[in-house]
């Protein structure tokens, strides 16, 4: 049975709208919820595509609007169609198309042939896509001053670039409780908007924003040590694209240290956590004397999945410890703002030479020639095998 509607179903999830001049908007298409494919042709009154037009078309994979009167596609037109992978807007009246329109989409192909596209920086992204062979871009005609059949390069003296963004930070060290002033300087042609991204800063400081393009200011009031390793980002957009720069404010605070009890893993480990900014230097003591690290006993930091914290975790790793390693381990941590120490007792093995005074004293008779293989059981304090 032939369909006499403006739009007719094609298969289980397609819609085809080809009756000439019957649509001026795509809003409110019937049964649009499950649509994966929408084909529109010969709609001279369809001149604009706004984000509201495609609301409710969350499953849309393919959109074709051809031989119609499309003059403008809003930068956020496809906000509600994140799965869109095929876009054909050929043979319309489009003079430009913003990079924002396709931002966030995983387009496999984009067809814009047969449009009076005007060569400008606003289409520089498209020229780059075509040159790089991205997602099967087809443009065929891009007008510089007049019609042409190929993608005309922008004039040599035309400088199309995304904005340049720089963040100025304080040179001096920042301490807990300080107010920090940051300034974001933006340079570029046809700047549209700019702002700060401060999502990581919650609880680390109170934020005050001021100023506008080309210079945005930010005051972080009463900063805490939680601000360390958190990104402060400034972004800016123009016709060509978007640029952003991130910095981290380093907030100095004193060293702190925590030690755990020795645990036997693949090797023995005395676990520790140290914090402080700048990162503290570490030194181990064994029974009050400096412990020289070797491949048998050394500090090993754990690889942290969290790159946004100053605290570092690790082990004093002991390979094959014996009774001579039993004793008091102290970790000293120091930075310019303070020092801290923590100690823990560790017992790895009983001393095989310890005996109860009540026990009979073992006596060994050495041969006269002195070729005995028995050892003096006295442990000499200065002969630790890990030194």
């Amino acid at each position: 049975a032939s369909c006499r509607e403006v739009c007719c179903p094609v298969g289980p999830s397609g819609l085809r709208c080809t009756r000439a001049g019957s649509l001026d908007t795509l809003r409110g298409l019937r049964g649009a919820g499950n649509l994966t494919e929408l084909y529109v042709e010969n709609q001279q009154h369809l001149q604009r595509l706004e984000f509201e037009d495609l609301q409710g078309l969350g499953e849309l994979r393919s959109l074709t609007i051809v031989k119609s009167g499309l003059r403008f596609v809003a930068p956020d037109a496809f906000r509600f169609t994140p799965r869109l992978s095929h876009l054909n807007l050929s043979s319309n009246a489009l003079e430009s198309l913003s990079w924002k329109t396709v931002q966030g989409l995983s387009l496999q192909d984009l067809t814009l042939s047969g449009n009076p596209l005007h060569c400008s920086c606003a289409l520089f992204w498209l020229q780059r896509w075509e040159q790089e062979g991205l997602c099967g871009v087809h443009t065929q005609t891009l007008h510089d001053s007049g019609p042409g059949d190929q993608f005309l390069p922008l004039g040599h003296n035309t400088s199309c670039g995304v904005p340049t963004v720089k963040i100025q930070m304080p040179n001096d060290s920042v301490e807990v409780g300080d107010d920090v002033f940051l300034q974001c300087q933006v340079e570029g042609l046809a700047l549209q908007q700019a702002d700060w991204i401060l999502t990581e800063l919650e609880g680390a400081a109170t934020v005050k924003k001021f100023g506008d393009l080309p210079s945005l200011g930010l005051i972080l009031v009463n900063v805490t040590s939680d601000l360390n390793k958190k990104n402060v980002t400034c972004w800016a957009e123009n016709d060509v694209g978007r640029a952003e720069v991130s910095v981290q404010v380093s907030v100095s605070f004193p060293a702190s240290v925590h030690l755990g009890l020795a645990v036997e893993q693949h090797h023995w480990c005395i676990p520790f956590s140290v914090d402080g900014q700048p990162a503290p230097s570490l030194r181990w003591l064994f029974n009050g004397s400096v412990l020289n690290e070797t491949s048998f006993i050394f500090t090993q930091f754990l690889e942290s999945a969290l790159t946004n914290e100053t605290m570092r975790h690790g082990c004093l790793r002991l390979n094959q410890p014996t009774h001579v390693n039993n004793g008091n381990y102290t970790l000293l941590a120091a930075n310019p703002y303070g020092q801290a120490a923590a100690s823990v007792m560790a017992a790895f093995m009983d001393n095989p030479f310890e005996f109860n005074p009540e026990d009979p004293i073992p006596v060994s008779f050495s041969p006269v020639d002195g070729n005995s293989t028995s050892r003096d059981p006295v442990e000499k304090k200065d002969e630790t095998p890990f030194g």
Partner: antibody, heavy 118, light 107 residues
Framework: QVQLQQPGAELVKPGASVQLSCKAS????????IHWVKQRPGQGLEWIGE????????NYIEKFKNKATLTIDKSSNTAYMQLSGLTPEDSAVYYC???????????WGQGTLVTVSA | DIQMTQSPASLSASVGDTVTITCRAS??????LAWYQQKQGKSPQLLVH???TLAEGVPSRFSGSGSGTQFSLKISSLQPEDFGTYYC?????????FGAGTKLELK
């Protein structure tokens, strides 16, 4: 798989210095100390020293303290040993080695033969 | 430093024989002893660590024993590929030291 790659040979003049390399692959370079061992022709094995690739910390046997200098280049996963003031007694094969899961040398480089000759 | 004394310095044997090499430490090294085999012009290969634990891929005809200061490596039913030089090494802290080696030759 774990590999320690060393160049085959170096010919140097008496009094000069030489830098030997040991390029590691197949494991996390910073997790294991690198050791160096000397073997003179027809002789036994002699431990020279060790270096922690994570922080460059070194330990040497006394007799090599003024002869050998161990360094690390983390970016290329390479350990180096510089031998200075070379004499004919320094002519030997020099091996780099690392522990396996236990504290014994499960992995060795092929060794670099250093010949000190005028 | 801990001294390691190996004996004999050399040893002749035939395929199928059983041989034992001994190693003495100058002080107690508990069970922290390793054995290596080296063929002419090649790097040493780990055979045994912690006195008696065989390294990966080492045949069961090799066995280690001992503790404290006295250690031995026994090779049962010698195979042609077993001839070479054997070294003991303590792994009880640095500096690490090796024995002078035992050269096992075909009789």
């Amino acid at each position: 798989q774990v590999q320690l790659q060393q160049p085959g040979a170096e010919l140097v003049k008496p009094g000069a210095s030489v830098q030997l390399s040991c390029k590691a692959s197949g494991y996390t370079f910073t997790s294991y100390w690198i050791h160096w061992v000397k073997q003179r022709p027809g002789q036994g094995l002699e431990w020279i020293g060790e270096i922690n690739p994570n922080n460059g910390l070194t330990n040497y046997i006394e007799k090599f303290k003024n002869k050998a200098t161990l360094t690390i280049d983390k970016s290329s996963n390479t350990a180096y040993m510089q031998l200075s003031g070379l004499t004919p007694e320094d002519s030997a094969v020099y091996y780099c080695a690392k522990y396996g899961n236990y504290v014994a040398f499960a992995y060795w480089g092929q060794g670099t033969l250093v010949t000190v000759s005028a | 430093d801990i001294q390691m004394t190996q004996s004999p310095a050399s040893l002749s044997a035939s395929v199928g024989d059983t041989v034992t090499i001994t190693c003495r430490a100058s002080e107690n090294i508990y069970t922290y002893l390793a054995w290596y085999q080296q063929k002419q012009g090649k790097s040493p290969q780990l055979l045994v660590h912690n006195t008696k634990t065989l390294a990966e891929g080492v045949p069961s005809r090799f066995s280690g024993s001992g503790s404290g200061t006295q250690f031995s490596l026994k090779i049962s039913s010698l195979q042609p590929e077993d001839f070479g030089t054997y070294y003991c090494q303590h792994h009880y802290g640095v500096p690490l030291t090796f024995g002078a080696g035992t050269k096992l030759e075909l009789k």
